[in-house]
Interface confidence: low
């Protein structure tokens, strides 16, 4: 049974793209009425508890640390809040993905990342980031350095033996400026990624302001 409580919030304290054997902190935004916060991972449509925190009012929002990240720990996470013993509320889901070589080595090759029309653009222009690989890829992910929000994910297109995805940033704003990387993934485990592409720096500069 769900009470009339606000939708809780879940976030990764750092990037949700985590290197193999790395760690990440997940924060479950507190609900005043909740006495217990549980972090769950959703695997094969079933919930598995990762941790739980008894909530005391003077404490900060409950945090959970996921250590030694691997393919088993990658996936969709949710915070579950107990309000009365029989009442609970779920947050949105947070996707955690892990980068690194999988045992079969099918993700060994890094993709390449390029930008059109130019890595230096003015606000309001249309920019496309192109992620490519010569190896079988089902989806590409694009992440921005320092961003805690989920990476963009696109299904790959097969173009003359190249697998690619075009990420459109249109129209660009100053918020789009930063360092981007892209990753390959296979449908067998969409939360397991290749090593990243070389970083690509996108500069969004307002030339009229500079002049």
């Amino acid at each position: 049974q769900e009470g009339d409580f606000p939708m809780p919030f879940i976030s990764a304290k750092s990037s949700p793209v985590i290197p193999l054997d790395g760690s990440v902190k997940i924060q479950c935004q507190a609900i005043r009425e909740a006495y217990l916060t549980q972090l769950m991972i959703i695997k094969n449509s079933t919930y598995r508890e990762i941790g739980r925190r008894l909530k005391f009012w003077n404490e900060t929002d409950p945090e959970f640390v996921i250590d030694h990240m691997d393919a088993n720990k990658a996936g969709r996470y949710q915070c579950q809040y107990r309000i009365g013993h029989y009442r609970f509320r779920y947050s949105d889901t947070l996707e955690l993905v892990v980068t690194g070589e999988e045992p079969a080595g099918r993700l060994r090759d890094r993709p390449s990342l390029s930008v059109r029309p130019s890595p230096s653009v003015a606000p309001g222009e249309n920019v496309t980031l192109l992620c490519q690989s010569g190896n079988r890829t089902d989806t590409f992910l694009l992440s921005k350095e320092g961003a805690a929000h989920r990476p963009l994910r696109l299904r790959s297109q097969d173009q003359d033996g190249w697998y690619q995805a075009e990420f459109s940033l249109s129209p660009v704003t100053s918020a789009h400026g930063g360092t981007y990387r892209c990753y390959r993934s296979l449908s067998t485990n969409p939360y397991l990624l290749s090593q990243p592409s070389e970083p690509l720096a996108l500069l969004v500069a307002d030339y009229t302001m500079q002049n």
Partner: antibody, heavy 122, light 112 residues
Framework: QIQLVQSGPELKKPGETVKISCKAS????????MNWVKQAPGKGLKWMAW????????THTDDFKGRFVFSLETSASTAYLQINNLKNEDTATYFC???????????????WGQGTTLTVSS | DVVMTQTPLTLSVTIGQPASMSCKSS???????????LNWLLQRPGQSPKSLIY???KQDSGVPDRFTGSGSGTDFTLKISRVEAEDLGVYYC?????????FGGGTKLEIK
């Protein structure tokens, strides 16, 4: 060790009020829920309410609304069951039981008080 | 409410012999947190209930090894490998997964 000690037997007349206490010891009172369970003579167990000892919020069944008041004195690690306007059918043994809340499987274990026998008779 | 059905109503067993009783729930007791809140109690004559098993199969402290709980979903079993005189009383199963918490009607264990 964990103990729940309840107040002694009560003999009351219909229309009167009774307040039964349950004093907990051996654990952090706020970290575990408290339940009240009724057992009429020769009958089975019937769950009445669960109290979130952290917030003081009771969750009870429709059968135990109105005349039944579930409260806490957290500083004394004590839970109370008060029944107003007593009726003959309230004659029963009332148990408090620690269960629920908590951060480990320990919260799923149940510990029971010795019971308080209430007799309502004119 | 979730209905808990215990069978048999009465169990007559000779000291030293095994005993088995069943508890069935009208809905699955697997909670959203992955746990199954199904416990077993023993109420000896004139005494308060005493916890035997919690979370389907976990023995409470001080409970003899001859008591074992098993089951999942809606079907649960309590077994006593060798009945002793102190085991007589009424055994209750109860669930805490769904609101409200409900008890089975009990199985009375008698000594032959």
């Amino acid at each position: 060790q964990i103990q729940l000690v309840q107040s002694g037997p009560e003999l009351k007349k219909p229309g009167e009020t009774v307040k039964i206490s349950c004093k907990a010891s051996g654990y952090t009172f706020k970290n575990y829920g408290m339940n009240w369970v009724k057992q009429a003579p020769g009958k089975g167990l019937k769950w009445m309410a669960w109290i979130n000892t952290y917030t003081g919020e009771p969750t009870h069944t429709d059968d135990f609304k109105g005349r039944f008041v579930f409260s806490l004195e957290t500083s004394a690690s004590t839970a109370y069951l008060q029944i107003n306007n007593l009726k003959n059918e309230d004659t029963a043994t009332y148990f408090c039981a620690r269960w629920g809340l908590g951060t480990t499987e320990e919260a799923a274990r149940d510990y029971w008080g010795q019971g308080t026998t209430l007799t309502v008779s004119s | 409410d979730v209905v808990m059905t215990q069978t048999p109503l009465t169990l007559s067993v000779t000291i030293g012999q095994p005993a088995s009783m069943s508890c069935k729930s009208s809905q699955s007791l697997l909670d959203s947190d992955g746990k199954t809140y199904l416990n077993w109690l023993l109420q000896r004559p004139g005494q308060s209930p005493k916890s035997l098993i919690y979370l389907v199969s976990k023995q409470d402290s001080g409970v003899p090894d001859r008591f074992t709980g098993s089951g999942s979903g809606t079907d649960f079993t309590l077994k006593i490998s060798r009945v002793e005189a102190e085991d007589l009383g009424v055994y209750y199963c109860w669930q805490g997964t769904h609101f409200p918490q409900t008890f089975g009607g009990g199985t009375k264990l008698e000594i032959k």
